[in-house]
């Protein structure tokens, strides 16, 4: 199917009323016209745009575009209409930033000025130079009034500034000195926080872009969810599940009269909510619009549950994962609760929060035991590894930003909110505050914000997820706000279920088909798993008992 945004390459057709028709008959949103991006792919959305005033340091293309002045006449067309390289522009025009303009209008490299060789056809590159005897060039003592910039541009590749004593090489905006004399492009995108989502580095500058489904907020330059359902924040307060619309800021009760609900998660596509009740020792599910009716609340798991404190829904493969701090296990089940197995029953002390990345096939969890840590493994329980084990005490909530591939967590003993990339690198402490992070518990991320609940403050806070600034209170007087999730379709991007792509149903697995972590292109897409009392047979698909009926309990 054709990209809905691009409209395909079919026969001539009318675009929607809020779309612009390109010359090549593509349809693009009207707001993309004259935004200096070639969205049509034939430049027609950037032609005939109102002339805009370019900055003094820019060159104005004939079609109104602005480009860096130094790109003019550099042999590469940067203007969509090529006017930066036209004869009219480049004949007797201003030379590039690292060039000297000869009297006849031609350009030579600035470092060739005053090098005692004639480089300009008219010799003007040697005019007005201080004639230094050859023997003096090696003399380090500087005669008063000597301007080194006049000789060979001081050796600077771009800008040479004469000083009272000596001289200084500097660079135009977007460039940096590499070796005191030579300018090279600054890769602003090396800073993971240069942009809220995608950073594209160009020579001398960079540009921020957004992933599909998001659009740039022209004021803040942050990526916001494109028009669609309003995002909402759903949280538990032990006795209820509540909802806050993040746009309208209205507040509603989703599920009343609960006993002791701490953990919850959502499946956006089916509009279902999942939650654990610590007192009843059960995991439940319901459609969000019917969840307030106890008759519509389905019990999924009520066997071998002790203290299910963390819950995560794999919306792609239709599984739920939960931590149990009483049994000291991490388990998985189908979303109907019908098939389940224990993935981890060893080396867990106080497992709490859990989050899943079904796109890459990984899960992440926090453990606030004596040796607190954040761990990750494949969604099938393989490749277990520790992500964070130092400077961590009580990691209560964790959440994933699948777009930036970062994990965020709150530590209620250190009063900190931190983030780290999915491989355990680039750790950043965003906020350290006994006021705003008095006893944080749950955490969620959406767009440019991070949200967290705080038990002592009885409030939900938000802050900028890149730098921890702009802290504000979203809701207060909440009485025990615990887990928190954002409900929006962009939080759960669609992907293929590897177990369904297989020729055999359920990947040929007799019991559970679990996605495998996608570490390389050779990684298996899934593996099979069996109930806790059975073993995977030699075909790695079917389940068998050994002689002892009840021998096996949680693996790995």
């Amino acid at each position: 199917a054709a990209d809905p945004l691009l409209g395909g390459q079919g026969p001539a057709k009318e675009c929607e009323k809020d779309q612009f028709q390109c010359r090549n008959e593509r349809c693009i949103p009207s707001v993309w016209r004259c935004d200096e991006d070639d969205d049509c792919l034939d430049h027609s959305d950037e032609d005939d745009c109102p002339k805009k005033t370019c900055a003094d340091s820019d060159f104005t293309c004939d079609n109104g575009h602005c480009i860096h002045e130094r790109w003019k006449c550099d042999g590469e067309e940067e203007c969509p209409d090529g006017s930066d390289e036209s004869e009219a522009t480049c004949t007797l025009g201003t030379c590039h930033g690292n060039e000297f303009q000869c009297g006849d209008g031609t350009c030579v490299l600035a470092i060739k000025r005053c090098n005692q060789e004639q480089d300009c056809p008219d010799g003007s590159d040697e005019a007005g130079c201080l004639q230094v005897p050859p023997t003096f060039l090696g003399n380090r003592r500087r005669p008063r009034g000597l301007n080194e910039c006049l000789h060979n541009n001081g050796g600077c590749s771009h800008i040479c500034t004469d000083l009272k004593i000596g001289f200084e090489c500097t660079c135009p905006a977007g460039f940096q000195l590499l070796d005191q004399k030579t300018c090279g492009d600054i890769d602003e995108c090396k800073d993971p926080d240069a942009c809220s989502q995608i950073c594209v580095n160009y020579k001398g500058y960079f540009k921020c872009e957004c992933y599909p489904g998001y659009e740039m907020d022209l004021l803040t330059k942050n990526c916001k969810a494109a028009a669609g359902k309003s995002p909402s924040l759903i949280f538990t307060n032990r006795h209820e599940v509540r909802r806050i619309d993040l746009v309208k800021r209205n507040y509603s009760r989703l599920i009343p009269m609960l006993k002791n609900v701490v953990a919850l998660d959502m499946e956006v596509a089916t509009n279902r909510i999942y939650w654990c009740d610590l007192s009843y020792r059960k995991i439940y599910s319901a459609y969000m619009d019917k969840a307030s009716d106890p008759k519509e609340q389905e019990v999924l798991i009520d066997e071998q549950l002790h203290s299910p404190e963390g819950l995560a829904v794999d919306w792609v493969h239709k599984h739920i994962y939960w931590t149990d701090s009483g049994n000291k296990t991490i388990s998985v089940a189908t979303v109907d609760g019908g098939r389940r197995c224990t993935l981890f029953s060893r080396n867990l002390s106080e497992p709490r929060a859990i989050a899943v990345d079904p796109l890459q096939g990984f899960m992440y969890w926090s453990d606030w035991g004596n040796q607190a840590k954040i761990e990750k493994s494949g969604l099938n329980g393989v490749d277990r590894q520790t992500l964070v084990s130092d400077n961590i005490e009580w990691p209560n909530g964790i959440t994933l930003d699948l777009l930036s591939q970062r994990l965020y967590w709150v530590d209620s003993k250190l009063h900190q909110l931190s983030s780290i990339d999915f491989s355990g690198g680039n750790r950043k402490m965003l906020i350290s505050s006994t006021d705003f992070l008095s006893h944080p518990f749950g955490i969620a991320v959406f767009e440019d914000k991070v949200f967290w609940t705080d038990l002592e403050n009885e409030a939900i806070f938000s802050a900028n997820r890149l730098n921890g600034l702009e802290i504000s209170i979203l809701a207060e007087n909440l009485n025990n706000p615990h887990d928190i999730v954002i409900f929006h379709e962009l939080k759960q991007p669609r992907a293929a279920d590897a177990c369904k792509l297989s020729v055999q149903p359920n990947g040929g697995c007799e019991y559970l088909c679990l996605p495998a972590p996608q570490i390389s292109s050779h990684s298996p897409k899934y593996t099979c798993a069996c109930p806790d009392t059975m073993w995977l047979g030699p075909d790695m698909k079917r389940c068998y008992r050994d002689g002892n009926e009840d021998s096996k309990m949680g693996s790995t």
Epitope: D302, D532, T533
Partner: antibody
Framework: EVQLVESGGGLVQSGRSLKLSCAAS????????MAWVRQAPKKGLEWVAT????????FYPDSVKGRFTISRDNAKSSLYLQINSLKSEDTATYYC???????????WGRGVMVTVSS | DIQMTQSPPSLPASLGDKVTITCQAS??????IAWYQQKPGKAPRLLIR???TLESDTPSRFSGSGSGRDYSFSISNVESEDFASYYC??????????FGGGTKLELK
Amino acid sequence: EVQLVESGGGLVQSGRSLKLSCAASGFTFSNYYMAWVRQAPKKGLEWVATITTSGSRSFYPDSVKGRFTISRDNAKSSLYLQINSLKSEDTATYYCARRGPLGYFDHWGRGVMVTVSS
Amino acid sequence: DIQMTQSPPSLPASLGDKVTITCQASQNINKYIAWYQQKPGKAPRLLIRFTSTLESDTPSRFSGSGSGRDYSFSISNVESEDFASYYCLHYDNLPPWTFGGGTKLELK
């Protein structure tokens, strides 16, 4: 060896109630869902009730819902089936069955006959 | 609910014959089918699960196959102790559990 032994059957008048029992041995009873399956004379098998390991949830087909109640006592390794408002179509051999971890019934008792007279 | 249609209801056979019983589900059951043998006055005995997996004490002359909605059960070389009734069962970890109507294998 897994053993399931049913008891409590017999001839009962229509409209009355009856409670069947099943004594289990040879396995950890509390680890398994248990079920009752019946078979009318010269007819096929029909599943009538299942109970979860802790006894907190039970399942029935629509045909018996409201009249049949399955229960269990894990301390005694016993399964029960309470049948109320007996009808002539409840006449059958009732089998106690263990639901294996993969979902099918892997062990069965020998059955107990219930005859409902009008 | 899923219905299981088993055929034929009765199947005459001689010793040494190969016989096949079929079960058709009203919708795709993803290979979750088991086959049972029942002799008069006895409890059913599990022979095959997950379409084709033989229980450890099931003789190799028994086999099962199928996918989607259509499944079959075969005895390659009928022996005298095989004359009995056979039932298919669609199972899952959650209800309902649905049996086929049964097939009586009789001596021709």
